[in-house]
């Protein structure tokens, strides 16, 4: 058992151009706090996957108000360390996520609001009991400087916190075969209870006769390195010179155990010994519980109904994500139609519509004909947010204000001649044709294919088209 400790030194604008705006203002004072999430191994895991090694939240920092016109300085930090206790062995290799959160202290309805300002992540090797390691990470225009270490809690000692120490029974020396516990020279190593031959460097035990392996090691005595990437020789025994073991075919080939689990062969198949926070046949199931406080922003933590979901965060209105860590941007529902711009105002959604569209969701084509009369008896037709006029005969243009040449479209059939007229056009038909557009042939016997011509009009006369 032991504690991972994180000390934040500074959080502020990183070097280079594009300094970030201060997260706080006179109108909206705020304060920072930090969250650290630890996972065993060097796995590339999603930010939302559980913090199987543990998580911690800092205290709130001092309230900060931006000085008008001043660049964002390093922001005031919370006091003290972030401490993540671990119950089992320290895995030696671990992944971390450090989040910087802003608590807004303005006139918030329903209390303060939290928002994620920056998130940094990394994968590191670290021996327990070693000195503080310093680190600098950048997230966008922000820079985070911090130190971290892992230390064992007595009576555990060693790089993995797996060796146990006990007070000396005699003042002068430890019992037979037992060494003093550096750096606690006044204590002695407890008698070994692990399986005989279990690697003192890469193995540990929690019960007598057991040998559990640290990340990167496998085999019954934790003497076999999991990684074989540097082994180029054919399958065979281990090479004493390179320390590289080329495994023979077997159920543990390629280590089927995920998340730092160690594989041991069984008569039929294999067995995974999983680190804390993981279980399942291949250590593929991770389990953070509500006791770890995984829900942010006032999310209610409920224990999952099955091992797959050790907890579920029920998020308050306005937040989402596995840990309620994301503000719901209701604009991601894509509510605005016709290219409208979506604005999530918190209390309501608004769509800012493009020209020619209206309605709460920009769903209506505006009737551009409203108040836009078409001249000279034309009728307005709307469509696609734009209007056009369907003009009466003899007129054209956008608003039917231009006189059109009615003969331009050559409306008279069969060689008839067209004459523009104040009320339209007149066709003078060629011999043998009649009708408004000279469209009807006149029968050879002199009878028309039409009913008798109106009084006063003989077939062949020019006919006016009204």
């Amino acid at each position: 058992a032991g504690v991972f400790e994180l000390q934040i030194h500074s959080f502020g604008p990183g070097p280079g151009p594009g300094a970030p705006r201060s997260p706080c203002s006179a109108r909206l004072p705020c304060r920072l706090f930090f969250r650290v999430c630890l996972k065993p191994g060097l796995s590339e895991e999603a930010a939302e996957s559980p913090c199987a090694l543990g998580a911690a939240l800092s205290a709130r920092g001092p309230v900060y108000t931006e000085q008008p016109g001043a660049p964002a300085p390093d922001l005031p930090l919370p006091d003290g360390l972030l401490q993540v206790p671990f119950r089992d062995a320290w895995p030696g290799t671990f992944s971390f996520i450090i989040e910087t959160w802003r608590e807004e202290l303005g006139d918030q309805i329903g209390g303060p609001a939290w928002s994620l300002l920056a998130r940094v992540a990394g994968r590191r090797r670290l021996a327990a009991g070693g000195p503080w390691a310093r680190d600098i990470q950048r997230a966008g225009a922000w820079e985070l400087r911090f130190s971290y270490r892992a230390r064992c809690e007595p009576p555990a000692v060693g790089t993995a916190c797996t060796r146990l120490c006990r007070p000396r029974s005699a003042p002068s020396r430890c019992g037979p075969g037992l060494r003093p516990c550096a750096p606690l020279e006044d204590e002695c190593e407890a008698p070994l209870v692990c399986r005989a031959g279990c690697s003192p460097e890469h193995g540990f035990c929690e019960q007598p006769g057991e040998c559990r392996c640290l990340e990167g090691w496998t085999g019954p005595l934790c003497t076999v390195p999991v990684s074989t990437s540097s082994c180029l020789s054919p399958r065979g025994p281990s090479s004493a010179t390179t320390g590289c073991l080329v495994p023979g075919p077997g159920p543990c080939d390629g280590n089927p155990c995920a998340n730092g689990g160690s594989c041991s062969e069984t008569p039929r198949s294999f067995e995974c010994t999983c680190p804390r926070g993981f279980y399942g046949l291949r250590c593929e199931v991770s389990g953070v519980t509500c006791a770890d406080g995984p829900c942010f922003n006032g999310g209610l933590c409920v224990g999952g109904a099955d091992p797959d979901s050790a907890y579920i965060c029920h998020c308050p209105p306005g937040f989402q994500g596995s840990n309620c860590e994301k503000r719901v941007d209701r604009c991601s529902l894509q509510p605005c139609r016709n290219g409208g711009l979506c604005l999530d105002l918190g209390h309501a959604l608004r769509c800012r519509c493009r020209a020619g569209f209206a309605g709460p969701r920009c769903e209506h084509d505006l009737d551009d004909c409203a108040g836009r009369a078409c001249a000279n008896g034309g009728t307005c037709v709307e469509g696609g947010g734009a209007h056009r006029c369907s003009c009466a005969l003899g007129f054209g243009g956008r608003d039917c204000r231009e006189r059109a040449d009615p003969c331009a479209a050559r409306p008279c059939a069969h060689g008839g001649r067209c004459y523009a007229h104040f009320s339209g056009l007149v066709c003078a038909c060629a011999p043998g044709y009649m009708g408004a557009r000279c469209e009807f042939p006149v029968h050879p016997d002199g009878a028309s294919a039409l009913p008798a011509a109106p009084p006063g009009l003989r077939p062949g006369d020019p006919q006016r088209y009204l």
């Epitope: 209105p317 991601s332 529902l333 894509q334 509510p335 605005c336 139609r337 709460p360 969701r361 769903e363």
Partner: antibody
Framework: QIQLVQSGPELKKPGETVKISCKAS????????MHWVKQAPGKGLKWMGW????????GYADDFKGRFAFSLETSASTAYLQINNLKNEDTATYFC??????????WGQGTSVTVSS | DIQMTQTTSSLSASLGDRVTISCRAS??????LNWYQQKPDGTVKLLIY???RLHSGVPSRFSGSGSGTDYSLTISNLELEDIATYFC?????????FGGGTKLEIK
């Protein structure tokens, strides 16, 4: 015309994974979010969440966090629902539906998933 | 979460009848209330959105009304093809929630 066509029925064992598809046609796929709705046998409709078809960002209702994943293949105008580590209680018909800003205006025909050992 | 309650789970009516189905929300949903029809073959269609707006292609015998927490769907002249289950759904607040459904049958 607007259509959402879902993949066929699935029969799975507990612990397995299923991936349901929903192919959209008749409109610009990336202009409308896609939603998923569950209907257990003889029960009502339960909204599972949505995926933004422009950014690919999903949002899940509380009861569907963890084993459920929404995804897209934008080039094929297709949305997917994947359910991992299936359980008997996942037996249901799953619908995809397009959201128009007010309501889910067009629905797929539904995909029946049966989980049985 | 907002609870949606359809108090009548099943309803019998005769062809030509005027039928009203009600739905109540546990809090004000600002008219963001939609009605869906699920036919016996399982297909789901939107009928009414934003309390009273008729979705395209839906017969005008369907209408919706209400405000605040109380809403209703009315079928003015029941036809055989209207035999289905009707669900209300609120779209005001995430997560969206449905009523339990009202099954409409012919007498």
């Amino acid at each position: 015309q607007i259509q959402l066509v879902q993949s066929g029925p699935e029969l799975k064992k507990p612990g397995e994974t299923v991936k349901i598809s929903c192919k959209a046609s008749g409109y610009t796929f990336t202009d409308y979010s896609m939603h998923w709705v569950k209907q257990a046998p003889g029960k009502g409709l339960k909204w599972m969440g949505w995926i933004n078809t422009h950014t690919g960002e999903p949002g899940y209702a509380d009861d569907f966090k963890g084993r459920f994943a929404f995804s897209l293949e934008t080039s094929a105008s297709t949305a997917y629902l994947q359910i991992n580590n299936l359980k008997n209680e996942d037996t249901a018909t799953y619908f995809c539906a397009r959201y128009d800003g007010y309501a889910m205006d067009y629905w797929g025909q539904g995909t029946s998933v049966t989980v049985s050992s | 979460d907002i609870q949606m309650t359809q108090t009548t789970s099943s309803l019998s009516a005769s062809l030509g009848d005027r039928v009203t189905i009600s739905c109540r929300a546990s809090q004000d949903i600002s008219n963001y209330l939609n009605w869906y029809q699920q036919k016996p073959d399982g297909t789901v269609k939107l009928l009414i959105y934003y309390t009273s707006r008729l979705h395209s292609g839906v017969p005008s015998r369907f209408s919706g009304s209400g405000s605040g927490t109380d809403y209703s769907l009315t079928i003015s002249n029941l036809e055989l093809e209207d035999i289905a289950t009707y669900f209300c759904q609120q779209g005001d607040m995430l997560p969206w929630t449905f009523g339990g459904g009202t099954k409409l049958e012919i007498k």
